[in-house]
Interface confidence: low
Amino acid sequence: GSLHSPGLSECFQVNGADYRGHQNRTGPRGAGRPCLFWDQTQQHSYSSASDPHGRWGLGAHNFCRNPDGDVQPWCYVAETEEGIYWRYCDIPSCHMPGYLGCFVDSGAPPALSGPSGTSTKLTVQVCLRFCRMKGYQLAGVEAGYACFCGSESDLARGRLAPATDCDQICFGHPGQLCGGDGRLGVYEVSVGSCQGNWTAPQGVIYSPDFPDEYGPDRNCSWALGPPGAALELTFRLFELADPRDRLELRDAASGSLLRAFDGARPPPSGPLRLGTAALLLTFRSDARGHAQGFALTYRGLQDAAEDPEAPEGSAQTPAAPLDGANVSCSPRPGAPPAA
């Protein structure tokens, strides 16, 4: 779940609403109850018939999904609505990058040793913001209302609990989980931060305040400079309220605007290959701004020709994005797989 291993995650929303994987039992690796097929659940509230455009990912399959904004993906396990007819799915790959897991907190000593606090309006981001402000790397939410701060060294001695133990709804947000009884849901504080300098070979950048909705009048910048001569960005989530909420991508060296996306003009679905080694991302929201925001993964490319469409060109220093640009490259049968 680290921000530096985004390729391992199938989910980028805190409640797994974007899960489109193929787990079809309530437990991982064949454990748990088998799920019913969504096209055979018309007697229930949710079925493929209630999702004709596939917006929620329902269809002629029995994969776990979250069509109703619940706290995590789930599925129906029984035909009738007597007793337990649905269950949450425990999907190890469905945790947003930056979520480090569910940890045991016995309280003596606490799993995260830094400052703590409680709030009847606790959300994941409220805790992240608190710990960020205190200068800590990690934030942990517990029992729906408690927030703890700590550092990587705390986790080294921490004990992982089953993911399903962190099942308590945050007091401040019905669509988020905030740990459990004696269980701490731990996040990296860089999630939803308003600034950052990203130099790891790959990673994830979230909109400010994520996983909460971004707030009004936000003006945030992130510098990307992973090793390599070029960059690849992939938007995993993009929901801006209107055209006045805008994300700009600029070449860090020249300040040249490479592209701007906004609520009316979202990014395309595929990876953006940018022939610049250093990128500046700027996000601005207007006075009304409130929406889920964005999550994007990036990875450094060794050269700007790591592009399946790019024919080999004559040697020239890459500094701006373009498929098929003349850049120095070595022969290769095809581009490497995405991270």
């Epitope: 605007l257 701007a260 940018l274």
Partner: antibody, heavy 119, light 107 residues
Framework: QVQLVQSGAEVKKPGASVKVSCKAS????????MNWVRQAPGQGLEWMGD????????NYNQKFKGRVTMTTDKSTSTAYMELRSLRSDDTAVYYC????????????WGQGTLVTVSS | DIQMTQSPSSVSASVGDRVTITCKAS??????VAWYQQKPGKAPKLLIY???YRYTGVPSRFSGSGSGTDFTLTISSLQPEDFATYYC?????????FGGGTKVEIK
């Protein structure tokens, strides 16, 4: 290889509408914006707007707002540009043009569709 | 909208000549300028992007320079196939706008 193939020439009367198609191949259609650019006889190039095929969201040049509609059909990898209330000064060659991977120029163009508006 | 003013509107030159075309933006567009070549009855072809980067397959005799508001396309040694109309375009913000074009004719 990337190809954009447009529909044939059209002759229309003033006040009518025209719908030009642009069939894309050789790349993942939903991964790139499709732009529409027109060129009146002997004149320069004028950007009309673009469409994001993945979301179906479009962005129009203010000059054409209210008269132009851009759509896509993902199943056939085809983009469409409809221009309504045609006037004689809409006589032009209409091009579809695909964005580059980095969005810094129009890397691929259709062959163009001549639309003649005449009474 | 950002205006792109190209000059000259036409130029007569001979094979082997050095040809320079300029483009002035009505406001700062950083290096967000592309250059296209268009021959009669054909679609434009991308030559230069981000002011100075040659697109794939474009001969090295074509070069671009400039930033801010002033940009230049240079053909170092004009070849017979280079007689065409050339357009600059800013992609700094929406809507992208083109210059009026420069026709390079045989002297």
């Amino acid at each position: 290889q990337v190809q954009l193939v447009q529909s044939g020439a059209e002759v229309k009367k003033p006040g009518a509408s025209v719908k030009v198609s642009c069939k894309a191949s050789g790349y993942t259609f939903t991964d790139y914006y499709m732009n529409w650019v027109r060129q009146a006889p002997g004149q320069g190039l004028e950007w009309m707007g673009d469409i994001n095929p993945y979301y179906g969201s479009s962005n129009y040049n203010q000059k054409f707002k209210g008269r132009v509609t851009m759509t896509t059909d993902k199943s056939t990898s085809t983009a469409y540009m409809e221009l309504r209330s045609l006037r004689s000064d809409d006589t032009a060659v209409y091009y579809c043009a695909r964005d580059s991977s980095g969005y810094v120029g129009f890397a691929y163009w259709g062959q163009g569709t001549l639309v003649t508006v005449s009474s | 909208d950002i205006q792109m003013t190209q000059s000259p509107s036409s130029v007569s030159a001979s094979v082997g000549d050095r040809v320079t075309i300029t483009c002035k933006a009505s406001q700062d567009v950083s290096t967000s300028v592309a250059w296209y070549q268009q021959k009669p009855g054909k679609a434009p072809k991308l030559l230069i992007y981000s002011a100075s980067y040659r697109y794939t397959g474009v001969p090295s005799r074509f070069s671009g320079s400039g930033s801010g508001t002033d940009f230049t396309l240079t053909i170092s040694s004009l070849q017979p196939e280079d007689f065409a109309t050339y357009y600059c375009q800013q992609h700094y913000n929406t809507p992208p706008t083109f210059g009026g074009g420069t026709k390079v004719e045989i002297k």
